[in-house]
Amino acid sequence: IWELKKDVYVVELDWYPDAPGEMVVLTCDTPEEDGITWTLDQSSEVLGSGKTLTIQVKEFGDAGQYTCHKGGEVLSHSLLLLHKKEDGIWSTDILKDQKEPKNKTFLRCEAKNYSGRFTCWWLTTISTDLTFSVKSSRGSSDPQGVTCGAATLSAERVRGDNKEYEYSVECQEDSACPAAEESLPIEVMVDAVHKLKYENYTSSFFIRDIIKPDPPKNLQLKPLKNSRQVEVSWEYPDTWSTPHSYFSLTFCVQVQGKSKREKKDRVFTDKTSATVICRKNASISVRAQDRYYSSSWSEWASVPCS
Amino acid sequence: RAVPGGSSPAWTQCQQLSQKLCTLAWSAHPLVGHMDLREEGDEETTNDVPHIQCGDGCDPQGLRDNSQFCLQRIHQGLIFYEKLLGSDIFTGEPSLLPDSPVGQLHASLLGLSQLLQPEGHHWETQQIPSLSPSQPWQRLLLRFKILRSLQAFVAVAARVFAHGAATLSP
């Protein structure tokens, strides 16, 4: 058993049929010694008496808020949550496996630049009685500070018969060094509590590996005289690290016909302009990637050819 | 062309070669299904590699103030990785494919380090750790880790030279 926060405790349980559970000692936070009784949750049924109580916790019915009273007055509370371990593996019932980029990916994180700011998100089908708390650090043995905000519900989607809820959190490394080569990964830890079930999820990454620039901005076409060619130009996204002479991007320019089956013409360039042939009904798209490190491409920025 | 005396490096040449190094490092070890090598307990193997750290002056401001600290750090790293790529980690079993980019990568590391420090000049270099894994599978894993680490190192070096070529070239 360990304390998650004041008066909230997590009981770690090996979860199998007829498991003996854990014996947990509760002590009433009071100078009183006599006449103390204990109840669980909203029930008025007294389960035990005395300042200290030993309870066997083996299932969710044994978890909840234990309250000690004296003469009708509440003295203190202890909330017990359960963390299940089945076949040596901690349960992951609360969050959905996003399966990208690999199986057992519950947290996904992205950064728009090298400033030390990043966003993580996760999915669940649970809509109520759900709380998250997020902690992060750079490295684990001698951790350096990363400050995370509160997790918020950022999207709701309908998936077949189910509703899916996306939560996200923004974090910022306290003393980020955008130009340095990271040697210690960022660690992100999410505590999830659904009713009386506790679970924790972690992710470990270097900012460089989660970089995904915003799409290029101000994408424009300039027709070239007496030609089917156009000059496409664009700019670095506002959110990208500066100076651009140091934090450089590379770009992919694509000409795509109306039909998905039509052949795509692609050009790669380090410049912020390119000359391409603009076919009728086609569109021109440009996306960006870090020039020197193959992290994710941005989403496409597009303009129609016409 | 040399830097040790405080003179300026051939920024444009260094830029071109460092960008080539980036391409080679990624072709030598592309992101295979996002293989997370940090899960493989690599503390003892890749912790000793020289990293370009915050105080090394490789940021735009530090380069403007005095690029020597940064260039010396990059040089140390290039020599370190060049030695690693020439060691039995890469020359031993399992043999690299004949068309493997590791050979080119090795040569380019040497080339860039010589651009930074021609014959006759000496910066102190970091000792290469004695890593000699006994099993071929350990060697393979170590190669992946070294290449992943090299990708991060050369990315920072390439940024330094690109910025230098754009802003510090005479």
């Epitope: 559970g21 007294v46 035990g48 008496s49 066997q56 083996k58 299932e59 019915g61 044994d62 | -």
Partner: nanobody, 114 residues
Framework: EVQLVESGGGLVQPGGSLRLSCAAS????????MFWLRQAPGKGLEWLST???????IYPGSGKGRFTISRDNAKNTLYLQINNLKPEDTALYYC????????RGQGTQVTVSS
């Protein structure tokens, strides 16, 4: 009508063991929280242990010590195992449906003496 009938008490030497039983009827035993209490001569009721329908147990203090409560829902029976009996364990032992003993049996006498 609720009925609780304790048995298994008797005269035991110090250091000995006893297993008390309580046969329950007249209510849904399998979904009830059950208690063992005792009353020593000239003293008030003392709570010994609690067991929930699922078999999860609750004891006073920081450990179950010498007392072990258990139940068999199929037999509608509650048990109390007492080990290493001491003279101060001499008392009337009751099973009850509440910690105050408002619904309890007639009790079974345990006497610990050499």
């Amino acid at each position: 009508e609720v009925q609780l009938v304790e048995s298994g008490g008797g005269l035991v030497q110090p250091g000995g063991s006893l297993r008390l039983s309580c046969a329950a009827s007249g209510f849904t035993f399998s979904s009830s929280v059950m208690f063992w209490l005792r009353q020593a001569p000239g003293k008030g009721l003392e709570w010994l242990s609690t067991i929930k329908p699922t078999g999860s147990t609750i004891y006073p203090g920081s450990g179950k010590g010498r007392f072990t409560i258990s139940r068999d829902n199929a037999k509608n029976t509650l048990y109390l195992q007492i080990n290493n009996l001491k003279p101060e364990d001499t008392a009337l032992y009751y099973c009850a449906r509440d910690i105050g003993g408002t619904v309890r049996g007639q009790g079974t006498q345990v006497t610990v003496s050499s």
